[in-house]
Interface confidence: medium
Amino acid sequence: DYKDDDDKGWVWNQFFVPEEMNTTSHHIGQLRSDLDNGNNSFQYKLLGAGAGSTFIIDERTGDIYAIQKLDREERSLYILRAQVIDIATGRAVEPESEFVIKVSDINDNEPRFLDEPYEAIVPEMSPEGTFVIKVTANDADDPSTGYHARILYNLERGQPYFSVEPTTGVIRISSKMDRELQDTYCVIIQAKDMLGQPGALSGTTTVSIKLSDINDNKPIFKESFYRFTISESAPIGTSIGKIMAYDDDIGENAEMEYSIEDDDSKIFDIIIDNDTQEGIVILKKKVDFEQQSYYGIRAKVKNCHVDEELAPAHVNASTTYIKVQVEDEDEPPVFLLPYYILEIPEGKPYGTIVGTVSATDPDRRQSPMRYYLTGSKMFDINDNGTIITTNMLDREVSAWYNLTVTATETYNVQQISSAHVYVQVFNINDNAPEFSQFYETYVCENAESGEIVQIISAIDRDESIEDHHFYFNHSLEDTNNSSFMLTDNQDNTAVILSNRTGFNLKEEPVFYMIILIADNGIPSLTSTNTLTIQVCDCGDSRNTETCANKGLLFIMGFRTE
């Protein structure tokens, strides 16, 4: 028995009640006063949290009972107060005393993994002993009672690749794994309390372990030989065909690059399709069946990213042989020149040969040609490619002709090619000079001798290699016209001067002056031009601007050419 030092009359045992008792009334012990002689004169009372609901006292004997199942993990200690009263007087026999009921642990809680789900990633081919993940189980039981909360970990599933340290829950690799064979492992770890002894409770957890990829595989061509065909007419950049290598690795480790080997002509190239990792063989230069009908090239494939320590796995890169057959294409005719410039003098009779164009069939059969000409009705072409005139050409009408010659193969009229032919008509001196404009010339009645009446100039429709040079002269035939004289200024202009003082409008209202103009062509051409001079009433001034009858003659139509 235990006697409380402060409350000397109280006697009780240490009170323990096992948790999880299924009985509805469990006797815990007895509280009594040493003054109680057993004649039922005392009444015992229980106070505090749990009194009357969880714990009950027999008022007569002081026996204490637990009437509810207790859970140590919920509450491990109850502090209650006891009273003992004399029934006769209603007074306390002893001072109120505090006592403790301890709930003793049973192993009723299994270890639980609170951090689920467990997921880990570890590189494939990791060596034995590599740390993967640590799992931890918790046991709600009392760690100070036996081994109720002492946990041992055990691998239920995952051998022979993984192991677990029994006391720490650290999972390690115990055998190398190849992601390309299996990429995910499901490991089951069991945690047992009681250090795994009989009566132990257990809990399990699943650990999902993913192997991350390392670049331990080189790409290998699916086929050792590829045959492709390409038309000789295919433009640069044309895709000839696809080659494919496979790599058991994933992601960046499977990224590959293709290259062309043994292609001295540098006709082909390989680009990669990043989505499919296929190599696309493309044309880098034009091919010509007549020049070479097939090509044999070799392609190589290797990874883009290789770690130094994994380089040994990537020696002897995979190669494949590619045969490219060039298909003969019925090609259109080819002109000897990309364009032609021909010359012909103007004024030649129709049927004159301008020049010859020539096209040939690049194919082996060398088809004869047929030619067609468009762009002008002044020309025609025969089956030999000779261009002739169909009219006399006048440079002053057209100095250039832009013609198109079309050549078709006789055997296949669908095969057509065209070339531009530029015909230049060059000048011959076939145009005499003439007045550059129509002159309305006036002379005042009171004009003085030597006075300038008109400055004239000329034009010539001919083309001149050097600058035109014109010569002016008074026609020898114009004997009756001595009232005016002409002076050549030597600059392609001439001046008409009055050769007398005074004119009479009424007597001689109009003068016609015949002027000869010659060019400097070979041979020189001369024209006769008439200048009409009207006498004018200028009043007191000698300025033709004030002429009263100005323009009347020209308006009335007395103009003579």
């Epitope: 509805t24 009334s25 057993g38 008022e59 007569r60 004997t61 026996d63």
Partner: antibody, heavy 120, light 111 residues
Framework: QVQLVQSGAEVKKPGASVKVSCKAS????????MSWVRQAPGQGLEWMGI????????TYAQKFQGRVTMTRDTSTSTVYMELSSLRSEDTAVYYC?????????????WGQGTLVTVSS | QSVLTQPPSASGTPGQRVTISCSGS????????VNWYQQLPGTAPKLLIY???QRPSGVPDRFSGSKSGTSASLAISGLQSEDEADYYC???????????FGGGTKLTVLG
Amino acid sequence: QVQLVQSGAEVKKPGASVKVSCKASGYTFTSYYMSWVRQAPGQGLEWMGIIHPSGGDTTYAQKFQGRVTMTRDTSTSTVYMELSSLRSEDTAVYYCARGGIKLWLHFDYWGQGTLVTVSS
Amino acid sequence: QSVLTQPPSASGTPGQRVTISCSGSRSNIGSNFVNWYQQLPGTAPKLLIYTNNQRPSGVPDRFSGSKSGTSASLAISGLQSEDEADYYCAVWDDSLNGWVFGGGTKLTVLG
């Protein structure tokens, strides 16, 4: 596990006495009260009294005062109920039941019952 | 004549909810804990509910007890055929200084 095993059926004449035993096992005998409850044929339950095996203290229902005696033998963990001056209306099944102190304690375990027939 | 009053009978079909009442006075239900017992035909009574609303282990949670003032009730939800039995309420009576039982209610599961 807790078990209460009662003695066999009895047939008694009016005026006689009957003593029914109840042997307890599976728990600390002296820590729990024992009550006696009877049930007449086709009738309800009727509480007769209680004994504390530790000190032998008893409390009897008013109706049976003077006619019933409850005793115990701690050495054999057995309680006894003796009913005297039997009448025909005492014909019933008599049960011992663990528990029954004031205020709280219920009857958590019951014996299988003993049929007492009072007949002339 | 019992100190505690119970209806003599009650019935329900499987799956239904049935309530059995127990009426007393201040000296019994009004002052003390109520217990309920189930007695299957030909067997000893069995503790069903103690201290008003507690269920011993092994008793299904379809059974529940409650107390209010001087009355108590037992509710059975999701009625099953094996629930067919007599049900008794019991409580300590301070005036009589002893245990009193209700007259019992015979529960019949129909159909």
